[in-house]
């Protein structure tokens, strides 16, 4: 058993059919020694009388709020939360497994640029009596300060007779250095409680595999005179770092026609402008990378032909 | 929302057998692990057993164990209580119920409840 937050403890219960289960014992918070009687949740039913109760946790059924009482004054109070193992395997049942890039991915987190910030995000389908709680590291056995703000419901959405809530948190590595050779990996930590289940999911990563650019910004065309050709032109992203002749993004540029069947012209460049052909409704779209490191791509940026 | 709805309950003679189902609308079920409770007349309302989300593990009240087997089709959206040996003192109406909690025989870690079945063992 450990203390999770102040009065909110979690028991360890590596649970099968018929397993004794783990004993605990809890003490009432008072100097007081004699008249002290203890109940669960908002039932009446006296467990046990004396300054500490030894209970066997078995299952959830044993989980709840404890309180201690002395001619009906509230003493103290310990919640008693579960982190259930079976088969060896701690369980996973509040986050859903995103399986990208790979399965048992419940956390994914991504960086628009090197400055230290990023953002995890993970999905659920429970929807009340939830609760989560997020730390992080740069490094584990002589961590690094990293400063994550609030978990919050960011979006929700309808998945067949689902709904799926996804949350998301913001982090920043208190001193980062933007221009550094990564030689430990970030930490994420998320405690989560639903109900009176505890579980808890990590995900460790160097910022440069999560970086993610933002899409291109004011992405132009200029027809060139007496041609079917176009310059197109865009710029660095805001969010990406600087200076640019530094952190060197490249990039992709695709001319697609109305009809997805139709045949893709794409251009790869390191510039801000390149000279495609402009067919009739096609459209033009640029997306970004890192050049000397390949992580991901950018959502694409685009304009209409016409 | 879940709605749950239980069938299968009958008159049987002690030492007989008989399967309840659950069949569960609304939200997605897979999600809910699934319990099984029964209230005799004059009594509280009794844990007989539970199955987790995907099916893989199952937990009894020591009453039942060994006679009833319960097992969960995600594809019907159904939970099943096979009873079997019944005797006398299993007459009861026979609650499914879903939860997010998995072990548990407390009734309040559910949060969805059907109407139940009535279930009578004669001798």
């Known amino acids: 058993i450990w203390e999770l937050k102040k009065d909110v403890y979690v028991v360890e219960l590596d649970w099968y059919p018929d397993a004794p289960g783990e004993m605990v014992v809890l003490t009432c918070d008072t100097p007081e020694e004699d008249g002290i009687t203890w109940t669960l949740d908002q039932s009446s039913e006296v467990l046990g009388s004396g300054k500490t109760l030894t209970i066997q946790v078995k299952e959830f059924g044993d989980a709840g709020q404890y309180t201690c009482h002395k001619g009906g004054e509230v003493l103290s109070h310990s919640l008693l939360l579960l982190h259930k193992k079976e088969d060896g395997i701690w369980s996973t049942d509040i986050l859903k497994d995103q399986k990208e890039p790979k399965n048992k991915t419940f956390l994914r987190c991504e960086a628009k640029n090197y400055s230290g910030r990023f953002t995890c995000w993970w999905l659920t389908t429970i929807s009340t009596d939830l609760t989560f709680s997020v730390k992080s590291s740069r490094g584990s056995s002589d961590p690094q300060g990293v400063t994550c703000g609030a978990a919050t419901l960011s979006a929700e959405r309808v998945r067949g007779d689902n709904k799926e809530y996804e949350y998301s948190v913001e982090c920043q590595e208190d001193s980062a250095c933007p221009a550094a050779e990564e030689s430990l990996p970030i930490e994420v930590m998320v405690d989560a409680v639903h109900k009176l289940k505890y579980e808890n999911y990590t995900s460790s990563f160097f910022i440069r595999d999560i970086i993610k650019p933002d899409p291109p910004k004011n992405l132009q065309l200029k027809p060139l005179k007496n041609s079917r050709q176009v310059e197109v032109s865009w710029e660095y992203p805001d969010t990406w770092s600087t200076p640019h002749s530094y952190f060197s993004l490249t990039f992709c540029v695709q001319v697609q026609g109305k009809s997805k069947r139709e045949k893709k012209d794409r251009v790869f460049t390191d510039k801000t402008s390149a000279t495609v052909i402009c067919r009739k409704n096609a459209s033009i779209s640029v997306r970004a990378q890192d050049r000397y490191y390949s992580s991901s791509w950018s959502e694409w940026a685009s304009v209409p032909c016409s | 929302e879940v709605q749950l709805v239980e069938s299968g309950g009958g008159v049987v003679q002690a030492g007989e057998s008989l399967r309840l189902s659950c069949a569960a609308s609304g939200r997605s079920f897979s999600n809910y692990e699934m319990g099984w409770f029964r209230q005799a007349p004059g009594t509280e309302r009794e844990f007989v057993g539970s199955i987790n989300l995907r099916g893989s593990s199952t937990y009894y009240a020591d009453s039942v164990k060994g006679r009833f087997t319960i097992s969960r089709d995600n594809a019907k959206n159904t939970v099943y209580l096979q009873m079997s040996g019944l005797k006398p003192d299993d007459t009861a109406v026979y609650y499914c119920?879903?939860?997010?909690?998995?072990?548990?025989?407390?009734?309040?870690?559910?949060?969805?409840w059907g109407q139940g079945t009535q279930v009578t063992v004669s001798s």
């Open positions: 119920a879903a939860g997010w909690l998995y072990p548990s025989s407390r009734s309040r870690d559910y949060d969805y």
